[in-house]
């Protein structure tokens, strides 16, 4: 029989973007395995990632059932092979993760500019409505479907020939901005949830400039 060296998991961290949600922890296992359990505050503890030697567990399938719920998670450590556990009185070692509220805590993924179209001195910029893993009636919802008017986009735009940026905001996925005729502009967007205190903003989208593929121009 081996030494008593089963250790509890630590540094439990939620990694979540656009509701794709993974729980990570340490240490890399030596003579032990892990099982993760997830629960809502009022619900069952459901086991996932059984007897795994990984130090992460994808919990997306569970949290997308109700993204406005509060979730609890814990990681159990079990001895591998003939190693005795350090748990007292036969109780397994486990560590609790901090509570996780997907609607509040998931990070906003980097948005993408889907297209822009110039008509005279107006440009219509459309942001791609990214699909999430949240389902309703067997279809995947978009970010806009989930967040509704809580989600806004900020557009940064500037003349290709200068560095002075202007901004516009929308609570849809479209911007209609005024531009100077004959000038080329560059665009970048950012997703924002103003009501949040943390994880309020996404990273900026890749820059798209007029005169490149995504644009259409009509006089």
């Amino acid at each position: 029989s081996g030494t008593t060296n089963t250790v509890a998991a630590y540094n439990l961290t939620w990694k979540s973007t656009n509701f794709k949600t993974i729980l990570e922890w340490e240490p890399k296992p030596v003579n032990q395995v892990y099982t993760v359990q997830i629960s809502t505050k009022s619900g069952d503890w459901k086991s996932k990632c059984f007897y795994t030697t990984d130090t992460e567990c994808d919990l997306t399938d569970e949290i997308v059932k109700d993204v406005k719920q509060t979730y609890l998670a814990r990681v159990f450590s079990y001895p591998a092979g003939n190693v005795e556990s350090t748990g007292s009185a036969g109780e397994p070692l486990f560590t609790n993760a901090r509570k996780f509220l997907p609607y509040r805590d998931t990070k906003l993924g980097q948005p993408t500019i889907q297209s822009f179209e110039q008509v005279g001195t107006k440009v219509n910029v459309t942001v791609e409505d990214e699909r999430t893993l949240v389902r309703r009636n067997n279809t995947f919802l978009s970010l806009r479907d989930v967040f509704g008017k809580d989600l806004i986009y900020t557009l940064y735009y500037w003349k290709s020939s200068s560095s002075g940026k202007k901004t516009a905001k929308t609570n849809t996925n479209e911007f209609l901005i005024d531009v100077d005729k004959g000038e080329n502009y560059c665009f970048s967007v950012q997703a924002v949830i103003p009501s949040r205190t943390v994880n309020r903003k996404s990273t900026d989208s890749p820059v798209e400039c007029m005169g490149q593929e995504k644009g259409e121009f009509r006089e």
């Epitope: 395995v33 099982t35 359990q37 069952d44 503890w45 459901k46 086991s47 059984f50 007897y51 030697t53 159990f76 079990y78 591998a80 092979g81 397994p92």
Partner: antibody, heavy 121, light 107 residues
Framework: QVQLVQSGAEVKKPGASVKVSCKAS????????MHWVRQAPGQGLEWMGI????????VYAQKFQGRVTMTRDTSTSTVYMELSSLRSEDTAVYYC??????????????WGQGTMVTVSS | DIQMTQSPSSLSASVGDRVTITCQAS??????LNWYQQKPGKAPKLLIY???NLETGVPSRFSGSRSGTDFTFTISSLQPEDIATYYC?????????FGGGTKVEIK
Amino acid sequence: QVQLVQSGAEVKKPGASVKVSCKASGYTFANYYMHWVRQAPGQGLEWMGIINPSGGITVYAQKFQGRVTMTRDTSTSTVYMELSSLRSEDTAVYYCARGGSKVAALAFDIWGQGTMVTVSS
Amino acid sequence: DIQMTQSPSSLSASVGDRVTITCQASQDISNSLNWYQQKPGKAPKLLIYDASNLETGVPSRFSGSRSGTDFTFTISSLQPEDIATYYCQQYNFHPLTFGGGTKVEIK
């Protein structure tokens, strides 16, 4: 087709060891956990432990800790269960059983035919 | 360890009868419960996984449901070939544990 074929019946003396084999075929051996479950005559089912064939990692029920060893040979897609310090109450049919797919990871969807181990002086 | 209390331990019913077996977990196990059928001299066979999902190829007269820590296994219309012992098994907590079994016989 998917199947698990176990080694034949064994008769052992108390204090001895027994090693039962379970050969898998018809599926990717490394992709599914393998479990061992035993059944004493006229009794119910008792889970002994699990082996992950891809890495050889094992987890045992505490009751068998220190007496059981599960191993695997990936070249022959075979798992082994060795039980030592045998006593009369270890007389049972020993089954290997495949853990199901990701959807039912710890449901035993394929079973071996069983190996009768008799411990008698 | 989680105790799985299965009842009744045996029952006798007529062909065509509705048969119900229950399994009670000693604590919350979510829907992490499977049901098996074992015929005399044979290995068990998976019928239901995750409390209510029918394994591929299993006749639809078999079903499972859950209410809290109580799990129910039902044969809607008993057939002669259903003579067997039925076991529940939980996998939400280590170690995995089985119920004591229910022997089903024909009247």
